[in-house]
Interface confidence: low
């Protein structure tokens, strides 16, 4: 079976004009997934990103996340790239409210 992930991108403010953007994938199966941040379509170096472990979420599916820190006002330049079971999707940083997207393939 394949269960596509729910992808949720959120922002949280940090000091000095920076924000942390977090891309969360949840409720997916199997556990193998790729999440990475891109700036202007180019993948960020791994030393500028942090990943959470892929963990069971209690429903027979899995969850994980990737985060990076960016300058406030540059949110539109960043997207979260997700790849799961041969499918892929790109998810923008929300402007204003949290963006939650159910992947549709």
């Amino acid at each position: 079976r394949t269960v596509p992930p729910m992808v949720n991108v959120t922002c949280s403010e940090v000091s000095e004009g920076n924000i942390t953007v977090t891309c969360r994938a949840s409720s997916f199966y199997p556990r193998n997934i790729t999440l990475t941040w891109r700036q202007d379509g180019v993948s960020l170096s791994h030393n500028t990103q942090q990943w959470g472990d892929v963990l069971p979420d209690g429903n027979g599916t899995y969850q994980t996340w990737v985060a990076t820190r960016i300058r406030q006002g540059e949110e539109q330049r960043f997207t979260c790239y997700m790849e799961h079971s041969g499918n892929h999707g790109t998810h923008p940083v929300p402007s204003g409210k949290v963006l939650a997207l159910q992947s549709q393939w």
Partner: antibody, heavy 119, light 108 residues
């Protein structure tokens, strides 16, 4: 059956451009990414770069000024171009498939092709 | 650059014995991004274990992986003749995505 096959000239002159193609079968490059790796004779493995399923690339910074990886999904091929080669670029060049969610690991490899840089 | 140091450089053992191969990273590597490959003479490398401890389908369960942070281990519980080869660890945690220099497992 998953297969990858590297092809290209076995001999390249110094300062010229090394061009290799990886032809794949048993899967589609629209659903799997690809890596290029090289191995100088008698030495270890060195990652050159990769191409994602949607065509974006990541490169080893050591090569970034002279490397290009591209894909032609209609031919099920992805390619490596390495410019301004020197004798230090003599190596066996491998293409490999990026496994699904295997955290960029390479789950299938071509058999490799030896490229010698010499005048 | 994260440097992966494998030890020992060469390991001489007999079939039936247990092999323990070490991979030490110069800085911390997420367990998700540490992989092991096997390479036999004249052949391409083959993925054995991904994300530290996950065995690739078709790889015998005498192979196992463990570790975290900077210290990772590949263990072969009972060596078979076909296991004698060079083993590489590989990290895709931080660019450039490096390999260890390899451990050669040879027949004693």
């Amino acid at each position: 059956q998953v297969q990858l096959q590297e092809s290209g000239p076995g001999l390249v002159k110094p300062s010229e451009t090394l061009s290799l193609t990886c032809t794949v079968s048993g899967f589609s490059l629209t659903t799997y990414g690809g890596h290029w790796i090289r191995q100088p004779p008698g030495k270890g493995l060195e990652w050159i770069g990769m191409i994602w399923t949607d065509g974006w690339t990541d490169y080893n910074a050591a090569f970034i000024s002279r490397v290009t990886i591209s894909v032609d999904t209609s031919k099920n091929q992805f390619s490596l171009k390495l410019s301004s080669v020197t004798a230090a670029d003599t190596a066996v060049y491998y293409c490999a498939r990026k496994g699904h969610g295997y955290y960029y690991a390479m789950d299938y490899w071509g058999q490799g092709t030896l490229v010698t840089v010499s005048s | 650059e994260i440097v992966l140091t494998q030890s020992p450089g060469t390991l001489s053992l007999s079939p039936g014995e247990r092999a323990t191969l070490s991979c030490t990273a110069s800085s911390s590597v997420s367990s998700s991004y540490l992989h092991w490959y096997q390479q036999k003479p004249g052949q391409a490398p083959r993925l054995l274990i991904y994300s530290t401890s996950n065995l690739i389908s078709g790889i015998p369960d005498r192979f196992s992986g463990s570790g975290s942070g900077t210290d990772f281990t590949l263990t072969i519980s009972r060596l078979e003749p076909e296991d004698f080869a060079v083993y590489y660890c590989h990290q895709y945690h931080r660019s450039p995505f490096t390999f260890g220099q390899g451990t050669k497992l040879e027949i004693k």
